[in-house]
Interface confidence: low
């Protein structure tokens, strides 16, 4: 019988005791072969952490801080659930740290130096780690003491709990820096006070912070949000403009054997017994001996965190970067000018070859990072492990759901202006055999399909949303009687087709031979009846363009191209038979390297891009013997993208339509695990 | 949780109009797509009409031009208008909600819900 215990860790006595009267509460709610609580008290949150490491506990709520410490090695922890404020309507499992100023200022979040500084406090999140984190790099050598750095910087403070006698610019707002709501200008209201006094500059507080102090919208609009792109927002344009995405309180437990999904259902019932306004007897959400104990006072609900998610996506790029720079003291970015390399994400071992052969030949502007999945890399862009990628279309929004955004984009036709002229997208076509005469769009059920990969634009975001949209379900598995898309179940039907070896074996990347466009192709060759590919995609394998030992012999005047309308038209059609026109690949990075990812490309495709004639003793940025190794091979050039610089603007509203309302069907972890810091 | 409650069922005579209500409660903010399927004595259940929370919509053909989906986000309720009703309309009309982490190819249900339905004839 499995143990169902979920051990909770308590730190003070008070905790112990209302922890006895949860684990006893539930007993008398929940059947015996239920989840059950047991409590384990602890001297403090680093003792808990660490305990539950130890697999001496299981269980603990956490602040935003100590998540990032639960996190670290060696105790490896993730968050498993989220507190919830607000609303059950509109639940706020996140806050945003904002830097308020008064309108007529007139300075930017780079011109900060000089300027008079409002603090919640020393040490914490919103009023000093994100913002100071954030000002780090710009903070006068040497950095260390911290708060002589950050007296140095700003021309005069007010952070309460600071010490006084060493450091007295930072107190300078405030005489005598008082830890407590003695001083008026502690806290969070307190340091907006700061700022309305005239006190200050710049407060750092949360969003939510003007809007409980001025009631009225004619006060507010006194007020400005300043952006980290270093423009100014409206205090009502938080999401748009902040520092960070902030966790309020977020149980934490082991990454490996962590009970995540006992846990969940230990709270999910606790909350339904014993939430907001459920139960006179206990209430989850209060603490009558204190304040907070084991959950928020404030909380109306827990949240399952997604799975796939670990504490620094949880905790969001910019607030694991702010932490860090204050506990390693480590600078995200040069702060000259120059561009530091830029680290791209290298697909498997095709594509990481590849990639050592281009960081050689870029002489350090260009250095590699591996992942086993496209959704891997994207995640490692996120959280800064890597920088940059071209994605196809449909992990273009998968990435601009995570924040991230199009930097370039992929040409595939030759024209005198290439850099300069974005194309309108390629052809999504499907293509069959011209000896099966008797299929047609229409007779696609049970028969054979070929996948470039779950996810991808043409191989599966297109004609699976052209088919969802005809049988209303998303079991495309029932729906074809076996094929290969590669990133399905294993166990899927949607596996049986693939070729790679053991472990291999529908991988969404090379080491799968079915994967991607000509791997689709080579699939229909083989095996299957129908191929979803792109319009370039035959001609590119077929007349001897391919040497492959599957590819040599074939003719392109066998294939044939399914059309929407029922008909089929020979394959150089495509114009006229095509299931959607598809946004081209493109180049993705975070918001803080658009410029230098943008820069140092360009100069890399002028020395290896499609001027380089001979690849046979060169290196050429976009050939790799039609695997598409990096980036397409067709490509000519990667052009800028103008005012396309979004996701949403880049794919276009047809497509993130289409993609939308897929998203049903979507097995896309990573893009639940994104839309639950940013819905 | 999310719990989904729908109203507005009845009996109608074939050319006149119902509207539908379905109002979602509990974690409503995890909610991506909504949508009203029906069943028929002796037929399959079939996807009647699709909302997603940016107000994308989809219709099945039989309904196009006569069906209008919409949603209250405030509210959290989705509605469905029907005009023009036919007696092949007659059925069992349930609401359903997907969640934003949801529905993996071969079909976990773990985050969708359903309501309980109401009945829709529709006389000639």
């Known amino acids: 019988v499995p143990d169902k215990t979920v051990r909770w860790c308590a730190v003070s006595e008070h905790e112990a005791t209302k922890c006895q009267s949860f684990r006893d509460h539930m007993k008398s709610v929940i059947p015996s072969d239920g989840p059950s609580v047991a409590c384990v008290k602890k001297a403090s949150y680093l003792d808990c952490i660490r305990a539950i490491a130890a697999n001496e506990a299981d269980a603990v709520t956490l602040d935003a801080g100590l998540v990032y410490d639960a996190y670290l090695a060696p105790n490896n922890l993730k968050p498993v659930v989220a507190e919830f404020y607000g609303s059950k309507e509109d639940p706020q499992t996140f806050y945003y740290a904002v830097a308020v100023v008064k309108k007529d200022s007139g300075f930017q979040m780079n011109q900060l130096r000089g300027k008079k500084s409002c603090h919640t406090g020393l040490g914490r999140s919103a009023g000093w780690n994100i913002p100071i984190g954030l000002l780090y790099c710009d903070l006068p050598e040497p950095r260390k003491p911290l708060e002589k750095a950050v007296a140095n910087f700003f021309s005069g403070s007010c952070a309460p709990c600071a010490d006084g006698t060493d450091f007295p610019q930072l107190c300078q707002l405030c005489p005598g820096c008082g830890c407590s709501t003695l001083n008026q200008y502690f806290g969070y209201s307190g340091a907006f006070k700061c700022l309305k006094d005239g006190a200050g500059d710049v407060a750092f507080v949360k969003h939510s912070t003007i809007f409980e102090n001025l009631a009225n919208k004619a006060d507010r609009d006194q007020y400005e949000l300043l952006c980290l792109d270093n423009t100014r927002k409206p205090v009502d344009e938080y999401k748009d403009c902040h520092l960070a995405q902030v966790p309020s309180h977020t149980v934490v437990a082991r990454s490996m054997g962590g009970k995540e999904d006992l846990i969940w259902e230990l709270l999910n019932q606790a909350q339904e017994h014993f939430g907001k306004d459920k139960s006179k007897e206990f209430q989850l959400f209060s603490s009558p001996h204190g304040k907070d104990l084991l959950f928020k006072d404030s909380a109306h609900g827990f949240l399952k965190v997604p799975p796939r998610m670990d504490a620094k996506m949880y905790l969001g790029y910019e607030y694991v970067t702010a932490i860090r720079n204050l506990r390693e003291g480590t600078c995200p970015e040069a702060p000259t000018d120059e561009c530091k390399p830029v680290k791209w994400c290298a697909l498997s071992h095709h594509e990481r070859l590849k990639c050592d052969e281009w960081s050689v030949n870029s002489v350090g502007k260009i250095e590699c990072v591996s992942a086993e999945t496209t959704e891997d890399c994207i995640a490692k862009i996120m959280n800064g492990e890597a920088d940059a990628m071209s994605l196809d279309g449909g992990f273009v929004y998968i990435a601009g759901k995570c924040g991230l955004v199009p930097v370039l984009a992929e040409n595939y036709n030759k024209s005198d202006n290439c850099e300069d002229t974005p194309e309108a997208g390629y052809f999504a076509i499907a293509v069959v055999k011209k000896s099966a005469s008797d299929l047609t769009w229409d007779n696609l059920k049970g028969k054979k399909s070929c996948h470039t990969a779950v996810g991808r634009t043409a191989g599966w975001n297109i004609p699976m949303g052209l088919l969802y949209n005809k049988i209303n379900h998303c079991r495309f598995d029932e729906f074809f009687s076996e094929g290969c898309a590669p990133g399905s179940k294993k166990d899927s039907s949607l596996c049986k087709l693939c070729m790679g070896s053991g472990l291999n074996l529908c991988e969404p990347n090379n080491k799968e031979g079915y994967y991607g466009y000509t791997g689709a192709f080579r699939c229909l060759v083989e095996k299957g009846d129908v191929a979803f590919v792109k319009h370039q995609t035959v001609p590119q394998n077929t007349g001897g363009k391919n040497p492959d030992p599957w590819a040599k012999n074939l003719n392109e005047k066998d294939y044939e191209l399914l059309c929407l309308d029922g008909t089929r038209k020979p394959v150089e059609e495509y114009a006229n038979c095509h299931l959607a026109r598809a946004p081209n690949h493109a180049v993705v990075t975070r918001k803080d390297k658009e410029a230098c990812v943008h820069k140092i490309l360009r100069q890399q495709q002028h020395l290896f891009g499609s001027n380089v004639t001979d690849c046979s003793g060169n290196f050429c940025l976009f050939r790799s013997e039609t695997k598409d190794l990096l980036f397409r091979d067709d490509t000519v050039c990667l052009a800028k993208l103008h005012d396309r610089n979004t996701y949403e603007k880049y794919l276009g509203e047809e497509y993130v339509k289409a993609v939308g309302n897929l998203r049903k069907c979507s097995t896309s972890s990573l893009l639940e695990a994104c839309t639950f810091r940013r819905p | 949780q999310v719990k989904l409650e729908e109203s507005g069922g009845g009996l109608v005579q074939a050319g006149g109009s119902l509207r539908l209500s379905c109002e979602a409660s509990?974690?409503?903010?995890?909610?991506?797509?909504m949508g009203w399927f029906r069943q028929a004595p002796g037929k399959e259940r079939e996807l009647v009409a699709g909302?997603?929370?940016?107000?994308?919509?989809n219709y099945a053909d039989s309904v196009k031009g006569r069906f209008t989906i919409s949603r209250d986000n405030a509210q959290n309720t989705m509605y469905l208008q029907m005009n023009s009703l036919r007696p092949e309309d007659t059925a069992a009309y349930s609401c359903?909600?997907?969640?934003?982490?949801?529905?993996?190819?071969?079909?976990?249900?773990?985050?969708?819900?359903w309501g309980q339905g109401t009945q829709v004839t529709v006389s000639s």
């Open positions: 359903n909600a997907v969640t934003k982490w949801a529905a993996r190819v071969g079909g976990s249900a773990e985050y969708e819900y």
């Open positions: 509990g974690n409503v903010f995890t909610i991506a797509a």
């Open positions: 909302i997603t929370t940016g107000g994308s919509t």
